[in-house]
């Protein structure tokens, strides 16, 4: 959408923005919209919050359609009520080592964050907090009903997760890459970010990728088989095209998505990969965006909680990205 046409706004009155979000004019100077916040997708029509020093980073000039709201170089971070300078590292809790970069915080877990699936030697794994220890540890609960274990074992799969090696050294550079943050949306198109210095100049940079944990339209609970409580990776009946702010992916994808549970567990990406996707817009412009593709999902009780500032903001991370 270019700005040369007459301004016309949605029929409903100007939106009410959440606390702390500015009401601003869109990029064409036409309509009042709620400003996009740090890390959110932005377009010419959906600008970033200027009062927070944010701008829409479109990446390469060829992709001037959809960007990510980014803080200007050197912008500080506010995290857990504390202000950190750009480039500053800090421990948000005993569980995470974090870095502030241009207004964005990337964190690496100091605890093992693997997802443990049932296995013959541990059919009912559960994470527990042990007294005097920071990191939660896996314990194996005894099954309540032993009869379940025998025949069901064939369905168990042991899945390892491979996170990036935080101590990788290359040409006088301690390569560090934070985990990909959880997708910003629980359904539909969102974004996931990370901070890395895995580049020629060994400089910290922010990376982002599109992500879709599950489509919003899908009523996944209907597909849960009788007697089961979860559908971990529902089968997608037909290849789909992704949509992004009016632009459509040029190829169709038989993508995997994460399912849902009816017993309070959450299903989240377990292993992912990052691939480029080309989107074609109504005006014929083509843009390339990196996107998360799910290899496997895991359903677990380790759902986001409010007891840890980092987990409640960023959980659940993506592990084993095969980018």
């Amino acid at each position: 959408q270019n700005c040369s046409g007459p301004c016309r706004c949605p029929d409903e009155p100007a939106p009410r923005c959440p606390a702390g979000v500015s009401l601003v004019l869109d990029g064409c100077g036409c309509c009042r919209v709620c400003a996009k916040q740090l890390g959110e997708l932005c377009t010419e029509r959906d600008p970033c919050d200027p009062h927070k020093g944010l701008f829409c980073d479109f990446g390469s000039p060829a992709n001037r359609k959809i960007g990510v709201c980014t803080a200007k170089d050197g912008a500080p971070c506010i995290f857990g009520g504390t202000v950190y300078r750009s480039g500053e590292s800090f421990q948000s809790s005993c569980k995470y080592q974090c870095t502030c970069l241009d207004g964005a915080v990337g964190c690496m877990p100091l605890c093992s964050m693997d997802v443990r699936l049932p296995s013959p030697d541990c059919p009912f794994p559960r994470r527990v907090k042990l007294p005097g220890k920071c990191c939660e540890e896996w314990v194996c609960d005894e099954p309540k009903d032993q009869t379940v274990v025998g025949p069901a074992l064939a369905a168990y799969r042991l899945e390892d997760t491979f996170g990036p090696d935080p101590t990788m050294i290359r040409a006088n550079c301690l390569v560090q890459t934070t985990e990909w943050s959880a997708c910003s949306k629980t359904c539909g198109m969102g974004i996931s970010t990370r901070v890395t210095n895995d580049n020629a100049s060994c400089r910290l940079e922010k990376q982002s990728r599109l992500c879709m944990v599950r489509p919003c339209e899908a009523d996944l609970e209907e597909n849960i088989k009788k007697g089961k409580k979860c559908i971990r990776t529902p089968k997608i009946s037909k290849p789909i095209k992704f949509e992004l702010s009016g632009c459509t992916s040029m190829k169709t994808y038989r993508a995997k998505f994460c399912g849902v549970c009816t017993d309070g567990r959450c299903c989240t990406p377990h292993r992912t990969t990052t691939l480029p996707v080309e989107f074609k817009c109504p005006d014929g412009e083509v843009m390339k965006k990196n996107m998360m593709f799910i290899k496997t999902c895991a359903c677990h009780y380790n759902c986001p909680g409010d007891n840890d500032i980092f987990e409640s903001l960023y959980y659940r991370k993506m592990y084993g990205d095969m980018a």
Partner: antibody, heavy 119, light 111 residues
């Protein structure tokens, strides 16, 4: 009562300037775009210009861009049309109109002010 | 975009139905998908007043004897039973493309 009152019209020589004003009342002025529409004697209506809520975007008829400027002062609930290098063909009744910026364009009109360009 | 109205003059008897046509030189669908086609009435000695917006929506206070229809490039204003207060000049207007343009006007008068 929602009201728009234009002023500033009159007789001016070709090449001269005039500044039209429109005072708004009875509504939240900053929630609306404003516009100017003119009507030459015995002729139809012609859109001249409009301006967004805060004055950061203005759109004018191409043929008038070099001579006319639209502006607004939300503190004074007023919109203005600065007309320079006036020509005989600019002779018209100039209407100030409220533009909803949404479904409809000009839902409230002023009574108009007459501009005559003649030597 | 040129807006062409027909007829330019429309003599009617009170109580009759009146129909005014407006044709645009190109499609007037805005890039947001809406069609900003409006109808205004200018009574003798008065300012114009909005009757219909977005092709078929009546402005508040406009009697239901006024109706608008059409799509693409062809639009119509109908008055089901003309009353004395309906006399004046009717203008169609498009607000989907710059420059914003009015039709040349149709004068509704008593036969």
């Amino acid at each position: 009562e929602v009201q728009l009152v234009e002023s500033g019209g009159g007789l001016v020589q070709p090449g001269g300037s005039l500044r039209l004003s429109c005072a708004a009342s009875g509504f939240t002025f900053s929630d609306y775009y404003m516009a100017w529409v003119r009507q030459a004697p015995g002729k139809g209506l012609e859109w001249v210009a409009n301006i967004n809520y805060e004055g950061s975007r203005t759109d004018l008829l191409d043929s008038l861009k070099s001579r006319f400027t639209i502006s607004r002062d939300n503190a004074k609930n007023s919109v203005y049309l600065q007309m320079n290098s006036l020509r005989a063909e600019d002779t018209a009744v100039y209407y100030c109109a409220r533009d909803t910026s949404r479904g409809s364009y000009f839902d409230v009109w002023g009574a108009g002010t007459t501009v005559t360009v003649s030597s | 975009v040129v807006m062409t109205q027909t007829p330019l003059s429309l003599p009617v008897s009170l109580g009759d139905q009146a129909s005014i046509s407006c044709r645009s030189s190109q499609s007037i669908v805005h890039y947001n998908g809406n069609t900003y086609l409006e109808w205004y009435l200018q009574k003798p000695g008065q300012s114009p007043q909005l009757l219909i917006y977005k092709v078929s929506n009546r402005d508040s206070g406009v009697p239901d004897r006024f109706s608008g229809s059409g799509s693409g490039t062809d639009f119509t204003l109908k008055i089901s039973r003309v009353e004395a207060e309906d006399l004046g000049v009717y203008y169609c207007f498009q607000g989907s493309h710059f420059p914003l343009t009015f039709g040349q006007g149709t004068k509704l008068e008593i036969k």
